[in-house]
C-alpha cells in the first residue's frame, strides 16, 4: 500500500558533542518492521544509517557515522522510527533523507540539523 | 502502550495558584511532546501550551503567557502543568496530550483530566 | 493563530446515516489535520491524522479528507457509538488550535 513519509517540519537542534534525535513517520502508519529503513545526506546519498531484513547494516554506513548511530525501532510497529546520532560534529550540520521502502514502493522526506557550539556565548575574558 | 496518568481533582480559591501532573508510562519520555489542552464546561477545546522533555523548552499560547509554567521531569517521566492567578473562568478539566517528538504531530494519547475548580 | 470554524456545530441524524463535518482553516495548513471524538466526561480521542490517515483500531466507517484550507469528516453508517463530539484540530503551527466542535445527537 501507499504511504507518505513525514519528518520534523523545522529545523532540529543540537549542540557539539552531544546526541541527536531524527523522528521520521509513515502516514497512515503501519507496521514498518519488514520494510526498508533508512538515512542518507544529500546530494551524495551518503548512508547513515540502514535498516533492511530486520537488521542494522553497519556494512553500508559512511566511515563518519559508523558506531555514531543507533536506530530507535520502539513504535516501528506503529511506522515511527528514530535515529539518533551521538558525539555530534559540526560536520553533521545540514540536510538528512530519511526514507521508508517496501517492495519496490518508496517515499522519503527531508529534514535539517542545526549544529551548535555549547561554548559560542561565553563572552572572552 | 503510552499511559498518561493525571493528579486528582483540585478546588481553588480566586488569586492562588494550581499546579498538575501528569505521569507517562509506556514508550520514551525522550520521543514526547507534552501539551496541556483544557476545556471549560460545556466548552471546547483550548491549547494552554506545551513542552519537549528532552529539550526542557516550553512554549505557550498567548493568551496563557506569564500565568502558566510547563516542566517536565525526565527522571520520573512526569510533566507538569502550573496556572497562578486563578478565577473563576479557569474551572476547567485540565487534560495533558501527547505528541510524537515534535510538535509537528497530532494528539494520539490523553491523559483522563483533572477537574480544576475555582471558588471562593 | 489559525482560526478553525467546525459546521454544522449540531447535527441531528439517525444510526445507518452518512454524517458528514466541515472544516475551515483560515489560511494553508496543508494536510497538518486532525479529528477527535469526545463523549461526556472522556478526553478526546484521535480518529483521523494528517487529515486523511485512520488512526489505528478506529473503525474504517470513519474517514477524512481535504488539504489546504477545507477538510472534511466523514462517517459512512453512523452507529449508536457515533453518538458524540467531534472537534478539528490543526498542527501546522506549534499554536494548535481547535474547531470549536459539533455535536452529533440522536435525530
Known amino acids: 500500500g501507499q504511504f507518505r513519509v513525514i519528518g520534523p517540519r523545522h529545523p532540529i537542534r543540537a549542540l557539539v558533542g552531544d546526541e541527536v534525535e531524527l523522528p521520521c513517520r509513515i502516514s497512515p502508519g503501519k507496521n514498518a518492521t519488514g520494510m526498508e529503513v533508512g538515512w542518507y545526506r544529500p546530494p551524495f546519498s551518503r548512508v547513515v544509517h540502514l535498516y533492511r531484513n530486520g537488521k542494522d547494516q553497519d556494512g553500508d554506513q559512511a566511515p563518519e557515522y559508523r558506531g555514531r548511530t543507533e536506530l530507535l525501532k520502539d513504535a516501528i510497529g506503529e511506522g515511527k522510527v528514530t535515529l539518533r546520532i551521538r558525539n555530534v560534529r559540526f560536520s553533521d550540520e545540514g540536510g538528512f533523507t530519511c526514507f521508508f521502502r517496501d517492495h519496490s514502493y518508496q517515499e522519503e522526506a527531508a529534514m535539517e540539523l542545526k549544529v551548535e557550539d555549547p561554548f559560542y556565548w561565553v563572552s572572552p575574558g | 502502550q503510552v499511559q498518561l496518568v493525571q493528579s486528582g481533582a483540585e478546588v481553588k480559591k480566586p488569586g492562588s495558584s494550581v499546579k498538575v501532573s501528569c505521569k507517562a508510562s509506556g514508550g520514551t519520555f525522550s520521543s514526547y511532546a507534552i501539551s496541556w489542552v483544557r476545556q471549560a464546561p460545556g466548552q471546547g477545546l483550548e491549547w494552554m501550551g506545551g513542552i519537549i522533555p528532552i529539550f526542557g523548552t516550553a512554549n505557550y499560547a498567548q493568551k496563557f503567557q506569564g500565568r502558566v509554567t510547563i516542566t517536565a521531569d525526565k527522571s520520573t517521566s512526569t510533566a507538569y502543568m502550573e496556572l497562578s492567578s486563578l478565577r473563576s473562568e479557569d474551572t476547567a478539566v485540565y487534560y495533558c496530550?501527547?505528541?510524537?517528538?515534535?510538535?509537528?504531530?497530532?494528539?494520539?494519547?490523553w491523559g483522563q483530566g483533572t477537574t480544576v475548580t475555582v471558588s471562593s | 493563530d489559525i482560526q478553525m470554524t467546525q459546521s454544522p456545530s449540531t447535527l441531528s441524524a439517525s444510526v445507518g446515516d452518512r454524517v458528514t463535518i466541515t472544516c475551515r482553516a483560515s489560511q494553508s495548513i496543508s494536510s497538518w489535520l486532525a479529528w477527535y471524538q469526545q463523549k461526556p466526561g472522556k478526553a478526546p480521542k484521535l480518529l483521523i491524522y494528517d487529515a486523511s490517515s485512520l488512526e489505528s483500531g478506529v473503525p474504517s466507517r470513519f474517514s477524512g479528507s481535504g488539504s489546504g484550507t477545507e477538510f472534511t469528516l466523514t462517517i459512512s453508517s453512523l452507529q449508536p457509538d457515533d453518538f458524540a463530539t467531534y472537534y478539528c484540530q490543526q498542527y501546522h503551527e506549534y499554536s494548535p488550535t481547535f474547531g470549536q466542535g459539533t455535536k452529533v445527537e440522536i435525530k
Open positions: 496530550a501527547r505528541e510524537w517528538y515534535w510538535p509537528d504531530n497530532p494528539f494520539d494519547y
